[in-house]
């Protein structure tokens, strides 16, 4: 498909800043125009682009889900940063949702790591020091976790 094959049509929208592409690419915070001659700014708080690009459209800003807090808002050059609320965490293998951290370790285990926005509490066997596999125990001790504070950017695009 040649560049000329695309015939864009843009409905009336609020006036957006334009600049010229450099070697066919537009800077972060912009997308390429209808005819490829202009760079059009993304809409603040609505969409964004992070790199030099030849995108027809800016990417939609992520909206933090319930159960998440917004650490930093979406700008034209950076997506929203979302983090799980205190007492919850997001696992790498299920990034769609925040899960509740366990409140304590199973009997015979001791807590060595707190609940953070990206990890559950960490438990090890008192004697051997081996880690607990992570399934919710039938009986828990009263060791409680304290939430961590560092930021974890939201990995989802929407």
């Amino acid at each position: 498909i040649t560049q000329q094959d695309l015939a864009p049509q843009q409905r009336a929208a609020p006036q957006q800043k334009r600049s010229s592409p450099s070697e066919g690419l537009c800077p972060p915070g912009h997308h390429i125009s209808e005819d490829g001659r202009d760079c059009i700014s993304c809409k603040y708080g609505q969409d964004y682009s992070t790199h030099w690009n030849d995108l027809l459209f800016c990417l939609r800003c992520t909206r933090c889900d319930s159960g998440e807090v917004e650490l930093s808002p979406c700008t034209t050059t950076r997506n929203t940063v979302c983090q799980c609320e205190e007492g919850t965490f997001r696992e790498e293998d299920s990034p769609e949702m925040c899960r509740k951290c366990r409140t304590g370790c199973p009997r015979g285990m001791v807590k060595v790591g707190d609940c953070t926005p990206w990890s559950d509490i960490e438990c090890v066997h008192k004697e051997s020091g081996t880690k607990h596999s992570g399934e919710v125990p039938a009986v828990e001790e009263t060791v409680t976790s304290s939430p961590g504070t560092p930021a974890s950017p939201c990995s989802l695009s929407g």
């Epitope: 864009p8 066919g24 997308h31 390429i32 609505q46 690009n53 939609r60 929407g158």
Partner: nanobody, 122 residues
């Protein structure tokens, strides 16, 4: 994970009209730009049309401009392609795609998902 299912294809006389639909299931596609592509027998897949996540900016290949109209209903998680003044050269399998964006030239950018296609014969 997003699943896309096209429908509405079929046989039509030259000059006739068809409306293709693409129903999305799984994760909502309201965050994604969406597009239509087509592949004629013995040819490469080509870009037809795309629109942004909000549905307010559309692009068309020159070959379909003025004849095809792309639209979306985010509430129904559905993409449409209204095709009119159809020609023999429009005969192809039409595919729906959802992507974070599309590059100039039509290539999908970022996460992207594809349907299985629906055959249009003119």
């Amino acid at each position: 994970e997003v699943q896309l299912l096209e429908s509405g294809g079929g046989e039509v006389q030259p000059g006739g009209s068809l409306r293709l639909s693409c129903a999305a299931s799984g994760r909502t596609v309201s965050n994604y730009a969406m597009g239509w592509f087509r592949q004629a027998p013995g040819k490469d897949r080509e870009f037809v049309s795309a629109l942004n996540w909000g549905g307010d900016t559309t692009y068309y290949a020159e070959s379909v401009k003025g004849r095809f109209t792309i639209s979306r209903d985010n509430a129904k998680n559905t993409l449409y392609l209204q095709m009119s003044s159809l020609r023999a050269e429009d005969t192809a399998v039409y595919y729906c795609a959802a992507a974070q964006s599309f590059r100039r030239g039509g290539a999908p950018y970022g996460d992207n998902y594809w349907g299985q296609g629906t055959l249009v014969t003119v």
